[in-house]
């Protein structure tokens, strides 16, 4: 079970210092961006961090939403990485959900975070490179210490 | 109603593994609905929460102890137990073992409502 | 984790007065805290939880209020038993932390 507690806006950046954002054909994508060029790309930049309590004491609980005509949220269904057309909803009943993932410090770096799937275990969000796009997917955390699967997270409230 | 009497060595050599048992009566920790947890506290300090188990066995731990701590549960016994290895100096705390409602919507959740009375527990060749 | 910061670290007063005890989480927790009440070489006992609701059997001079980050433990009339070390502790999200405790003593 999951209840909804409160939500942030969040501008999320890989270790490159590499912007998330939702491109056109909602799709999450990273790129250089400056300080300037993320403020004129809201609200592509600005991710709706939902909190969670969770009936299990896993950690922090998030969903990750997006408000452009309307709001999407990330799933990781079937291990794909897309966004999907819904509001977080107030309460998940369910231990696991595609659009629930535990947000965690990683040890000795407080400002750096890491985002596991709650439906898959030790899948991790994380930064790919494919071809000339920096994508957003879903991965098994394979070596201790793996950047791709670190993100910083900055509250814009 | 439900009460948690606390057992095992006091004195631990470094480098050995602390072990502490917790027995329930007036209560069954197969029922459902509760964790069954461990904290701990320095003399002169805060409070630490240890790790908790769950009747269906699942266990969850404080990641800052995660690499040393097993929690398991003997429902025969109605009993769950603490063990954590490598100890050290720093280890030396009272250990409380405490009954946790769970949350599945509730508000009287995720509290330590129902203590044992504490073991201190010294690390020390 | 969650850190939560408790003030006073110390508070004297005397019978009768009226005490609060103030807690600060280093991020929003919404409503999900407790406050533990622990006499020396006694386990804590659980006074308040979900900020504001009374464990049963718990005085009606208890009382707390906040959400979000900023919550308060008030105590409207001091009796002789209530000196004593309180925690606050989230309860919100794992892993389950405490403040360090305000001690309570007799001025």
């Known amino acids: 079970y999951f209840g909804k507690l409160e939500s942030k806006l969040s501008v999320i950046r890989n270790l490159n210092d590499q912007v998330l954002f939702i491109d056109q054909g909602n799709r999450p994508l990273f790129e250089d961006m400056t300080d300037s060029d993320c403020r004129d790309n809201a609200p592509r930049t600005i991710f709706i961090i939902s909190m969670y309590k969770d009936s299990q004491p896993r950690g922090m609980a998030v969903t990750i939403s997006v408000k452009c005509e309307k709001i999407s949220t990330l799933s990781c269904e079937n291990k794909i990485i897309s966004f999907k057309e819904m509001n977080p909803p107030d309460n998940i009943k369910d231990t696991k959900s595609d659009i629930i993932f535990f947000q965690r410090s990683v040890p000795g770096h407080d400002n750096k975070m890491q985002f596991e799937s709650s439906s898959y275990e030790g899948y991790f969000l994380a930064c790919e490179k494919e071809r000339d796009l920096f994508k957003l997917i879903l991965k098994k955390e394979d070596e201790l210490g793996d950047r791709s699967i670190m993100f910083t997270v900055q509250n814009e409230d | 109603q439900v009460q948690l009497q606390q057992s095992g060595p006091r004195l631990v050599k470094p480098s050995q593994t602390l072990s502490l048992t917790c027995t329930v009566s007036g209560g069954s920790i197969s029922s459902g609905g509760y964790y069954w947890s461990w904290i701990r506290q320095p003399a002169g300090k805060g409070l630490e929460w240890i790790g908790s188990?769950?009747?269906?066995?699942?266990?969850y731990y404080n990641p800052s102890l995660k690499s040393r701590v097993t929690i398991s549960g003997d429902t025969p016994k109605n009993q769950f137990s603490l063990k954590l290895s490598s100890v050290t100096a720093a280890d030396t705390a009272v250990y409380y073992c405490?009954?946790?409602?769970?949350?599945?919507?509730?508000?009287?959740?995720?509290?330590?409502?129902?203590w044992g009375r504490g073991t201190l527990v010294t690390v020390s060749s | 984790d969650i850190v939560m910061t408790q003030s006073p670290s110390t508070l004297s007063a005397s019978v009768g007065d009226r005490v609060t005890i103030t807690c600060r989480a280093s991020?929003?927790?919404?409503?999900?805290l407790a406050w533990y009440q622990q006499k020396p070489g006694r386990a804590p006992k659980v006074l308040i939880y979900k900020a504001s609701t009374l464990e049963s059997g718990v005085p009606s001079r208890f009382s707390g209020s906040g959400s979000g980050t900023d919550f308060t433990l008030t105590i409207s009339s001091l009796q002789p038993e209530d000196f004593a070390t309180y925690y606050c502790a989230n309860i919100a999200f794992p892993p389950w932390t405490f403040g360090q405790g305000t001690k309570l003593e007799i001025k």
């Open positions: 991020q929003g927790i919404s409503s999900w």
């Open positions: 405490a009954r946790t409602p769970a949350y599945f919507g509730q508000d009287r959740t995720d509290f330590f409502d129902v």
């Open positions: 188990i769950y009747y269906s066995g699942s266990t």
